[in-house]
């Protein structure tokens, strides 16, 4: 059985494109399941690896790698 | 479950600007974007933009852009959606709304804020 | 940016009836199509995504179809809780546009 495009698995019932955009940035394995490109995490893969030891809660990132500060905190690790 | 539950409704000058809340609930905030939607009287739906929660990115529908700012609060589990710049035609009732789990549209919905404006 | 172009934009029928609204994309959307209902005062429900995959507890009397540029949602009998306001609406590339919708009336 050949699926259509984007879609996998036995009855080709996964559905899953690969994106590197705002909504996501994942590949797709041949099972249909998201697999996330370097730096990003969660089930869409679009939130993005802080730098390492970045202060979950007064750093943030928006690209991997990134520590940005809430106002108010500074230093490398936003701590 | 998730639940998205919106601030109330506001009457606003032309000119002025407005501030609508969604508290989200049920899942984990940062893991998904929060996207708006906003519907006049009477009229079909329109995508205003987004935003992930985790470290503030953006992405708005041009229409709007310059106009509508997206931000979103982790503490406390709630997106923000502020209109500047109102005229008569941004009376609407906008909704907070969250995609699915498996690359769904947005299959979570806020009840919506009707947002008035007029003189 | 993606325009979708739905029709009829209205349409009168009765219970038991098929009922079929199209929606055509100005692009190739390739099956990231979504419909929603829509009810007087209350948020749309979704129905269908990825063009043909029904989602939770919606009724089996709802399907779609298509691909590429033209889609269709089927309802095969309806019942008098379908009577409300249908959207097609694409998610295949910022901004998300929606048709602009069906209202389905009582005949």
């Known amino acids: 059985v050949t699926c259509d495009d984007y879609y996998y698995g036995f009855g080709c019932n996964k559905f899953c494109r690969p994106r590197d955009d705002f909504f996501g940035h994942y590949a797709c394995d041949q099972n249909g399941n998201k697999t996330c490109m370097e730096g990003w995490m969660g089930p869409e893969c679009n939130r993005a690896i802080c730098r390492q030891g970045c202060s979950p809660k007064h750093g943030s990132c928006k690209l991997p790698g990134d520590c940005r500060c809430q106002y108010g905190w500074q230093g490398l690790y936003c701590d | 479950q998730v639940q998205l539950v919106q601030s109330g409704a506001e009457l606003k000058k032309p000119g002025s600007s407005v501030k609508v809340s969604c508290k989200a609930s049920?899942?984990?905030?940062?893991?998904?974007?929060m996207h708006w939607v906003r519907q006049a009287p009477g009229q079909g739906l329109e995508w205003m933009g987004a935003i992930q929660p985790g470290g503030g990115g953006t992405a708005y529908n041009q229409k709007f852009k310059g106009r509508v700012t997206l931000t979103a609060d982790k503490s406390t589990s709630t997106a923000y959606m502020e209109l500047s710049s109102l005229r008569s035609e941004d009376t609407a009732v906008y909704y907070c709304?969250?995609?699915?789990?498996?690359?769904?549209?947005?299959?979570?919905w806020g009840q919506g804020t009707l947002v008035t404006v007029s003189s | 940016d993606i325009q979708m172009t739905q029709s009829p934009s209205s349409l009168s029928a009765s219970v038991g009836d098929r009922v079929t609204i199209t929606c055509r994309a100005s692009?190739?959307?390739?099956?990231?199509l979504a419909w929603y209902q829509q009810k007087p005062g209350k948020a749309p429900k979704l129905l269908i995504y990825n063009a043909k995959t029904l989602a939770d507890d919606v009724p089996s009397r709802f399907s779609g179809s298509g691909s590429g540029t033209d889609y269709t949602l089927t309802i095969s009998s309806l019942q008098p809780e379908d009577f409300a306001t249908y959207y097609c609406q694409h998610f295949w590339s910022a901004p998300w546009t929606f048709g602009g919708g069906t209202k389905l009336e009582i005949k």
């Open positions: 709304t969250r995609r699915g789990y498996d690359d769904y549209p947005f299959a979570y």
């Open positions: 049920g899942y984990t905030f940062t893991d998904y974007e």
């Open positions: 692009g190739n959307i390739h099956n990231y």
